[in-house]
């Protein structure tokens, strides 16, 4: 089938990063500079991504692949192929509409995306407060008074929080 | 497949709140990309309002910045939009959509007047 | 605000024709161009992002090309269900800003 196929068209000869060239007789012509063709029997070449501003490249465009972006320090991804940069905040902060505010009392972030969580409830498992909690950190859950006995230290901290789903780019 | 549904009010008095939902169904709102409300005029022009990414961070369009806010319910897969103090000028057809790649996913739309 | 500029409102052209419809940036959006299309009472569906890039499932008849400031949107061979409405936008800073369209009539 692929033997017939190419006899009828020439252009499925072409391999990625080569175009089929119209205005050569249908030859196959290597992709211009700043673009690429990822597969072959391509009639035109795509134009490479270009990474500038607050977009930087992370991966080089070549004849066969296109440019891969990440964002410059400061900024990070979101958005499938990060088409987009969201502002980074410091750890204890929450990015708002009107900037980077400090997270407050009773909440914390321990990451430089996403919102302010509230501290860790201790008491609604019947424990007790063992390091309090800041702006960046949550606290930390002891024992219960009740179950203070000589040689008992089971503390307990809270699950790590994470930035849910987010793979970095 | 992800779906998206706006729904909301279609009449809204002068000088009072907007409030649209939008429903995500097909995908967790909490486990990546940004989500959108953009709206589109009589005429046609399009305008991005703003977003809520995954994490809970906010961007909003700075002509706005003063009247909107936009929120979720987790629990319900859900975004809102809520833009105060309206007048004649906001009245449009409000869409909600997903940043994957890029604008990938919206919401069929709904139609709000603003009027006495 | 970086401004997006259609300059042409509307496009007649009929079926087979290769018809080009541009979009212009108020400064250098660095591919950072995504195109829609939109049917009459439909919500917009993306086409193009990164300036050339086919998002899943549109026909090949659609290409994207541009960089800096000059984008156009390429429909090779103009079918009867491509009359829409054209949108480009720009992903490069908020607030991201839109094009006024670009309505494309079948003769």
């Known amino acids: 089938f692929e033997r017939t196929r190419s006899l009828q068209d020439p252009c499925s000869n072409c391999p990625a990063g080569t175009f089929c060239d119209n205005n050569r007789n249908q030859i196959c012509s290597p992709c211009p500079p700043n673009s690429f063709s990822s597969a072959g029997g391509q009639r035109t070449c795509d134009i490479c991504r270009q990474c500038k501003g607050v977009f930087r490249t992370r991966k080089e465009c070549s004849s066969t692949s296109n440019a891969e972006c990440d964002c410059t320090p400061g900024f990070h991804c979101l958005g499938a192929g990060c088409s987009m940069c969201e502002q980074d905040c410091k750890q204890g902060q929450e990015l708002t509409k009107k900037g980077c505010k400090d997270c407050c009392f009773g909440t914390f972030n321990d990451q430089k995306r996403g919102i302010c969580r509230p501290w860790t409830n201790c008491s609604l498992d019947g424990k007790s407060v063992l390091v309090n909690g800041t702006k960046e950190r949550d606290v930390v859950c002891g024992p219960s008074p009740a179950d203070l006995s000589p040689g008992a230290s089971s503390v307990t901290p809270p699950a790590p929080a994470r930035e849910p789903g987010h793979s970095p780019q | 497949d992800v779906q998206l549904q706006e729904s909301g009010p279609g009449l809204v008095k002068p000088s009072q709140s907007l409030s649209l939902t939008c429903t995500v169904t097909?995908?967790?709102?909490?486990?990546?990309?940004?989500w959108n409300w953009i709206r589109q005029f009589p005429g046609n022009r399009l305008e991005w309002m703003g977003y809520?990414?995954?994490?809970?961070?906010?961007s909003y369009n700075p002509s706005l910045k003063s009247r909107i806010s936009i929120t979720r319910d987790t629990s319900k897969n859900q975004f809102f939009l809520q833009l105060n103090s309206v007048t004649t000028e906001d009245t449009a057809t409000y869409f909600c959509?997903?940043?994957?790649?890029?604008?990938?996913?919206w919401g069929q739309g709904t139609s709000v007047t603003v009027s006495s | 605000d970086i401004v997006m500029t259609q300059s042409h409102k509307f496009m007649s052209t009929s079926e087979g024709d290769r018809v080009s419809i541009t979009c212009k940036a108020s400064?250098?959006?660095?591919?950072?161009v995504a195109w829609y299309q939109q049917k009459p009472g439909q919500s917009p569906k993306l086409l193009i992002y990164?300036?050339?890039t086919r998002h899943t499932g549109v026909p090949d008849r659609f290409r994207g090309s541009g960089s800096g400031t000059d984008y156009t949107l390429t429909i090779s061979s103009v079918q009867a269900e491509d009359l829409a409405l054209y949108f480009c936008?720009?992903?490069?800073?908020?607030?991201?800003?839109f094009g006024g369209g670009t309505k494309l009539e079948i003769k």
């Open positions: 959509a997903r940043w994957g790649y890029v604008l990938d996913y």
């Open positions: 097909g995908y967790s709102i909490t486990s990546d990309y940004a």
């Open positions: 809520i990414s995954y994490s809970g961070s906010t």
């Open positions: 400064q250098d959006v660095s591919t950072a």
């Open positions: 990164w300036a050339s």
């Open positions: 936008q720009q992903h490069y800073f908020t607030p991201y800003t």
